[in-house]
């Protein structure tokens, strides 16, 4: 659904928001999956989205930084394999991820991202359609 | 359909600033987010940045940073982009465009800015 | 910043022709990129999304190919309402466009 692919593609410009300002955020380390096995994608997106990201204080960048993540975490509407998803046992705990600092942490999390829009892409049929 | 109009040409002298205005209609202002690109004369496109019409978020091209401010009015479905400090460099056809899955979908029909003292 | 480069800067061609434009991104992209069409005095029309895929209502002759720096776009056969500029765009990072391809009458 176009709307799904749209918020995957608005996380993406938000992380890459935050990849500019990576030296203001607060450098804890945090889960950041990667190599997600097959149908636990949504699982590890909320992993990313429950993850405690934030800023270091550093004055100026506070505000756009703060704001980026709070937009980062607001859930969207979910679809039927996220439902599904959330409450599969198989899928690994947020905490069995490995821990990586923010800059590692917000590649990581683009990366899904973009798996998961190729992935959608390639269960649409290649014809004329809308982007 | 989706329709995209935008305020008419401007001129103006540097130092000043000015504010663009581009109206919706015919989809869901909030469902989605917009962008702004210019054109400058007989030049390429220029992303410039873009804001989500549903709150204030914005992200902006580094290029403009503290020149750029992007803000919308819900109650009209009306995006606006203002440019400050204005300069010689900055005459271009300014564009808003909405924000698709994918691409920008749908663009404005313009708006000529002209910098002149 | 990722800059894209495109070539050739401009072509002359006639009706019928192939034609075939290209694009470089200075890193890897996947296939984040987009093709627009450009007519003087008019605003840019979206052609092909994510390097391949066909806008609606843009005809088969166009194509698009490509993957991670280097990408195409070819028109099979070139039609009178097809002169104009081409642009290609990334959106792997934010977004950044092509300087531009114009085609024209030979």
């Known amino acids: 659904q176009d709307r799904h692919m749209i918020r995957m593609r608005q996380l993406i410009d938000i992380v890459d928001q935050l990849k500019n300002y990576v030296n203001d955020l607060d450098p804890e380390f945090l889960p950041a999956p990667e190599d997600v096995e097959t149908n636990c994608e949504w699982s590890a997106i909320s992993c990313f989205q429950k993850a405690q990201l934030k800023s270091a204080n550093t004055g100026n960048n506070e505000r756009i930084i703060n704001l980026s993540i709070k937009k980062l975490k607001r859930k969207s509407p979910s679809t039927g394999a996220e439902r599904r998803q959330k409450h599969r046992l198989t899928c690994p705990s947020c905490d069995s991820y490995e821990k990586k600092p923010p800059k590692e942490f917000l590649e990581r999390f683009k990366s899904l991202l973009q798996k998961m829009i190729h992935q959608h892409l390639s269960s649409r049929t290649h014809g004329s359609e809308d982007s | 359909q989706v329709q995209l109009v935008q305020s008419g040409a401007e001129v103006k002298k540097p130092g000043a600033s000015v504010k663009v205005s581009c109206k919706a209609s015919g989809y869901t202002f909030t469902d989605y987010w917009m962008h702004w690109v210019r054109q400058a004369p007989g030049q390429g496109l220029e992303w410039m940045g873009l804001?989500?019409?549903?709150?204030?978020?914005?992200i902006y091209n580094q290029k403009f940073k503290g020149r750029v401010t992007m803000t919308r009015d819900t109650s009209t479905s009306t995006v606006y982009m203002e440019l400050s400090s204005l300069r010689s460099e900055d005459t271009a056809v300014y564009y808003c465009?909405?924000?698709?899955?994918?691409?920008?979908?749908?663009w404005g029909q313009g708006t000529l800015v002209t910098v002149s003292s | 910043d990722i800059q894209m480069t495109q070539s050739p800067s401009s072509l002359s061609a006639s009706v019928g022709d192939r034609v075939t434009i290209t694009c470089r991104a200075s890193?890897?992209?996947?296939?984040?990129l987009n093709w627009y069409q450009q007519k003087p005095g008019k605003a840019p029309k979206l052609l092909i999304y994510y390097t391949s895929r066909l806008h609606s209502g843009v005809p088969s002759r166009f194509s698009g190919s490509g993957s991670g720096t280097d990408f195409t776009l070819t028109i099979s056969s070139l039609q009178p309402e097809d002169f104009a500029t081409y642009y290609c765009q990334q959106f792997h990072t934010l977004r950044t466009f092509g300087g531009g391809t114009k085609v024209e009458i030979k």
């Open positions: 890193q890897d992209i996947s296939n984040y």
């Open positions: 465009a909405r924000y698709g899955p994918l691409a920008m979908d749908y």
């Open positions: 804001i989500d019409t549903s709150d204030v978020y914005t």
